[in-house]
Amino acid sequence: CDLPQTHSLGNRRALILLAQMGRISHFSCLKDRHDFGFPEEEFDGHQFQKTQAISVLHEMIQQTFNLFSTEDSSAAWEQSLLEKFSTELYQQLNDLEACVIQEVGVEETPLMNVDSILAVRKYFQRITLYLTEKKYSPCAWEVVRAEIMRSLSFSTNLQKRLRRKD
């Protein structure tokens, strides 16, 4: 499955929008910094086939979309930027969804892929718990915004590598 050219443009737009969403200086939130343990090994693109990589990318974008679709998120960010960001993620989900279905049809997720999907889910669990513990404070959201920028960059790079493989 070839992801459309608009998909990579959408990735870039999402990152730009997320950068624009920053409301407070990252430096004023240094005390709130946290290591969420991003599962880099799931995004290095070496250990699995394209089909599996797309499933993991889908999980990553889906969890990001869910995180920024909550009521707490709506209260934290400027509404029009948040809506545009969510729209970009939604389009990416549609592209990836079509690819997952096209690549393998609807079938059981390969065993190796299962642990990758769980690793992504656990990563977002850690982010969710952090926000809960920090009572969704502005600094907590700023730390999470910076973290998601980093994780989306990894996703974008993996997608570039997948296109080069084609």
Partner: antibody
Framework: QVQLVQSGAEVKKPGASVKVSCKAS????????MHWVRQAPGQGLEWMGE????????IYNENFKSRVTMTRDTSTSTVYMELSSLRSEDTAVYYC????????????WGQGTLVTVSS | EIVLTQSPATLSLSPGERATLSCSAG???????LYWYQQKPGQAPRLLIY???NLASGIPARFSGSGSGTDFTLTISSLEPEDFAVYYC?????????FGQGTKLEIK
């Protein structure tokens, strides 16, 4: 509000198959994995597997792998769990439960569907 | 597969008393992925505590959770009549996800 409504009770003969449905409402259906958990009479809970309604991929518990099939219909926001080669030990209440994160993990359950396997 | 063993199987106490329910894992479970559910007859399970120690929405403060590694505990500080039910611990730290066999909390 989030609601999961399951199909009604079923009585099946050994060797037959059963298909239980779970209709979701109150949230975006394709955003969350849906799980199936069963409970035999007087017994504990057993996780059977999960399906991503967005693309239909599944993850099954090895104990059920050869007999279970989970599917979804996005047009009706419904997931299905089909169990084949039924035996008396499969007599149980089958629940669907929505995934999520933090306080949303298995926070929403269907009302349960009793499947009785008897000759 | 991570086996979760709950003890005791049945706990007989009176309203007002303190209840301590244990959940022991066959191998280490990260506390972020250990949950507790309450189930009453004829009903679906209800989320009580998530990530070992966090109270789910609408759950009274008399419920609390603690533990790490392989040993986890659910405590009810002062039992109310509506607390008598079956309690399950659950992990989603690794596939397949598993539940304990349950502890039945009954009125003495």
């Amino acid at each position: 509000q989030v609601q999961l409504v399951q199909s009604g009770a079923e009585v099946k003969k050994p060797g037959a198959s059963v298909k239980v449905s779970c209709k979701a409402s109150g949230y975006t259906f394709t955003n969350y994995w849906m799980h199936w958990v069963r409970q035999a009479p007087g017994q504990g809970l057993e996780w059977m597997g999960e399906i991503n309604p967005s693309h239909g991929r599944t993850i099954y518990n090895e104990n059920f792998k050869s007999r279970v099939t989970m599917t979804r219909d996005t047009s009706t926001s419904t997931v299905y769990m089909e169990l084949s080669s039924l035996r008396s030990e499969d007599t149980a209440v089958y629940y669907c439960a929505r995934g999520g994160l933090g306080p949303a993990w298995f926070a929403y359950w269907g009302q349960g569907t009793l499947v009785t396997v008897s000759s | 597969e991570i086996v979760l063993t709950q003890s005791p199987a049945t706990l007989s106490l009176s309203p007002g008393e303190r209840a301590t329910l244990s959940c022991s894992a066959g191998s280490s479970v990260d506390s972020s992925y250990l949950y507790w559910y309450q189930q009453k007859p004829g009903q679906a399970p209800r989320l009580l505590i998530y990530s070992t120690s966090n109270l789910a929405s609408g759950i009274p403060a008399r419920f609390s959770g603690s533990g790490s590694g392989t040993d986890f505990t659910l405590t009810i500080s002062s039992l109310e009549p509506e607390d008598f039910a079956v309690y399950y611990c659950h992990q989603w730290s690794s596939y397949p996800f598993t539940f304990g066999q349950g502890t039945k909390l009954e009125i003495k």
